[in-house]
């Protein structure tokens, strides 16, 4: 019997300092370029090697970026989001949503968690 796939969703504030090649990641998404079906959010498509995001280590490919310096990224055209990042300044605060895939075992199976008592 196969286990079902669940997702653990967490949010994190990530502060990056712009490097010589920018923030060091690419984005996809927007109201005119949906990356996820029925979701016009902005997602990280690629982390550039040795860029600011890679060196920080917290931002991951597939993360959803919720805001930049407090500016909500809901319902933006793709290029509007790109330009927000481009003009965000030297110190950039990102609110991101990580979506971690959790593989649950078959029903009745208990993983090696903490003792229940």
């Amino acid at each position: 019997m196969n286990g079902r796939v669940d997702y653990l969703v967490t949010e994190e504030e990530i502060n990056l300092t712009r490097g010589p090649s920018g923030l060091g990641f690419n984005i996809v998404g927007g109201t005119d370029q949906q990356y996820v079906s029925n979701d016009s959010g902005i997602y990280v498509s690629r982390i550039k090697e040795n860029g600011a995001a890679a060196l920080d280590g917290r931002l991951q490919e597939g993360d959803k970026i919720l805001s930049v310096n407090g500016q909500d990224l809901k319902n933006l055209l793709h290029q509007d989001a790109v330009d927000l990042f481009r003009n965000a300044g030297y110190a950039v605060s990102l609110r991101v949503q990580h979506r971690l895939q959790v593989q649950n075992g078959p029903i009745g199976h208990r993983g090696e968690g903490d003792p229940s008592g």
Epitope: L77, H78, Q79, D80, D83
Partner: nanobody, 124 residues
């Protein structure tokens, strides 16, 4: 893909009027500007309007004769030109600020990241 398409140019007699339009797609909430370039001359600032439409500035050579406006529902900017003179003959370009919801409008050509192909205005 960002596109700015100007229309409304043409041949007009001195003293006449024209209304130029600039339809924008691919970006929104941008300060918008109009510039012009006459043959053999540098590109010159004409007018600019804030992304909310509440603030405008004009170049000295056209002040009092042109009005810039916008319709955000249509993502379109307009340039109403009156009392046209032969020296207004030029290619008129529409431009969008490179910054999303930028705070201050400017006549600085360098801040305008997106440009249309231009529309010819000839005043005889």
């Amino acid at each position: 893909h960002v596109q700015l398409v100007e229309s409304g140019g043409g041949l007009v007699q001195a003293g006449g009027s024209l209304r130029l339009s600039c339809a924008v797609s691919g970006v929104s909430f941008r300060n918008m500007g109009w510039f012009r370039q006459a043959p053999g001359k540098e590109r010159e600032f004409v007018a600019a309007i804030s992304w909310g439409g509440d603030s405008t500035i004009y170049g000295d050579s056209v002040k009092g004769r042109v009005t810039i406006s916008r319709d955000n529902a249509k993502n379109t900017a307009y340039l109403e030109m009156n009392s046209l003179k032969p020296e207004d003959t030029a290619v008129y370009y529409c431009a969008a600020d490179g910054r999303f919801r930028a705070g201050r409008i400017s006549s600085d050509l360098g801040l305008y990241h997106y440009w249309g192909q231009g529309t010819q205005v000839t005043v005889s």
